[in-house]
């Protein structure tokens, strides 16, 4: 079976985790893609998905997650904007493909969210608030309920660098809400 | 433990041909996408060229577009890249890297091979 | 292509001191910057990925910081195996990348 590994970011409130899933474009280019956040001993939740099938290079945001798809490059692109200490926590994307049970990319994400913004010159708190306030066209997002099983009990321990709790939420707006934004790099 | 090796550098006159070899161990080979990284004698870092981790996906620098192609064979955890036309600033050690899988940045090198184009 | 600028390409040091290396890069690419340490005769050696993400197994003597297009890589104490080339890598979600010219920190 292949290892399941995590790749650790960290980063202060505020700031925006701008990450990246690579699949096999051949197989999966135009399949609807998920975020997940895996809570200790719980079902994947989806937090965010692209539509159904999903469109090449065609930002989708549901409240601080946007998810681009690119096809050409077989990547899907996540951004979390405007960080909470209560996004910490562990992540992956997973493609869905009914009626099989959802395929997951590696590696996943840990996530570690810090207080107080590091106020450094050219760091990413403004870049991502812009991205925030566009104005919201919104329709429904139709993301699968569910979730392989298998997945629950593949979830490492979490570190002990991860200050979530396990009832922690991610602060979201509606999830249903996906809200189209323009392409910016 | 995560290895690349790299082999197939040489001596080669200029307008000729060399395939540079990249050995990977340790790691889910198939699931990473793969570069070629070069660096001319007293220079800086130069980005050659990249794959997907299925080998859907292929880039290059302008400087070898046309004359140099990757390839892999997963089945080998192998990596390629061939060299045609070689000119004499293509002289330098060339280093095979994998990406991390969220990031474009390169988490493991190889050792390096040395290919010198001179008549 | 996205160019990256780093400066200073070099930089003469001491044990102990505090070193900044900055990279612009001539547009935004918001997180997408790694740096790496390169010593003569050897491959170079990833140091932070993500603008600000400590690679695993690297001191925490090294960070970065930065976003959109202007970054830093700080060494907090300059120790005697520091002594290197360090370079800045960008690629905007997908390649081309790019590398910045390097700084060569010596010692004083």
């Known amino acids: 079976a292949t290892k399941l590994t995590e790749e650790k970011y960290e980063l202060k409130e505020g700031q925006t985790l701008d990450v990246k899933c690579d699949y096999t474009l051949e197989k999966f280019a135009s399949s609807q893609k998920a975020w997940q956040i895996i809570r200790d001993g719980e079902m994947p939740k989806t937090l965010a998905c692209t539509e159904r099938p999903s469109k090449n290079s065609h930002p989708v945001q549901v409240g601080r997650i946007i998810l681009e798809d690119y096809h050409d490059h077989g990547l899907l692109r996540v951004r979390m904007v405007n960080l909470q200490v209560e996004d910490s926590g562990l992540y992956q994307c997973v493609i869905y493909q009914p009626p099989k049970e959802p395929h997951m990319l590696f590696d996943r994400i840990r996530l570690v969210v810090t207080k107080g913004f590091s106020g450094t010159p050219g760091s990413n708190e403004n870049s991502t608030q812009n991205v925030y306030k566009i104005p919201p066209t919104t329709t429904k997002a139709l993301c699968p309920l569910y979730t392989s099983p298998r997945t629950v009990t593949q979830a490492p321990p979490k570190s002990t660098a991860d200050v979530s709790t396990p009832d922690s939420e991610i602060n979201l707006t509606n999830v249903t809400d996906i809200i189209r934004v323009p392409v910016f790099n | 433990e995560v290895q690349l090796l790299e082999s197939g550098g040489g001596l080669v006159q200029p307008g000729g041909s060399l395939r540079l070899s990249c050995a990977a161990s340790?790691?889910?080979?198939?699931?990473?996408?793969m570069s070629w990284v070069r660096q001319a004698p007293g220079k800086g870092l130069e980005w050659v060229s990249a794959?997907?981790?299925?080998?859907?996906?292929?880039y290059y620098a302008d400087s070898v577009k046309g004359r140099f192609t990757i390839s892999r064979d997963n089945s080998k955890n192998t990596l390629y890249l061939q060299m045609n036309s070689l000119r004499a600033e293509d002289t330098a050690v060339y280093y095979c890297?994998?990406?991390?899988?969220?990031?474009?940045?390169?988490?493991?090198w190889g050792q390096g091979t040395m290919v010198t184009v001179s008549s | 292509d996205i160019q990256l600028t780093q400066s200073p390409s070099s930089v003469s040091a001491s044990v102990g001191d505090r070193v900044t290396i900055t990279c612009r890069a001539s547009?935004?690419?918001?997180?997408?910057l790694a740096w790496y340490q390169q010593k003569p005769g050897k491959a170079p050696k990833l140091l932070i990925y993500a603008a600000s993400s400590l690679q695993s197994g690297v001191p925490s003597r090294f960070s970065g910081s930065g976003s959109g297009t202007d970054f830093t890589l700080t060494i907090s104490s300059l120790q005697p195996e520091d002594f290197a080339t360090y370079y800045c890598?960008?690629?905007?979600?997908?390649?081309?990348?790019?590398f910045g010219g390097g700084t060569k920190v010596e010692i004083k």
């Open positions: 890297a994998k990406s991390k899988h969220s990031t474009t940045s390169l988490d493991v």
């Open positions: 890598q960008q690629a905007v979600i997908h390649p081309p990348y790019t």
């Open positions: 547009q935004d690419i918001s997180s997408w």
């Open positions: 794959i997907s981790g299925s080998g859907g996906s292929t």
């Open positions: 340790g790691f889910t080979f198939s699931t990473y996408a």
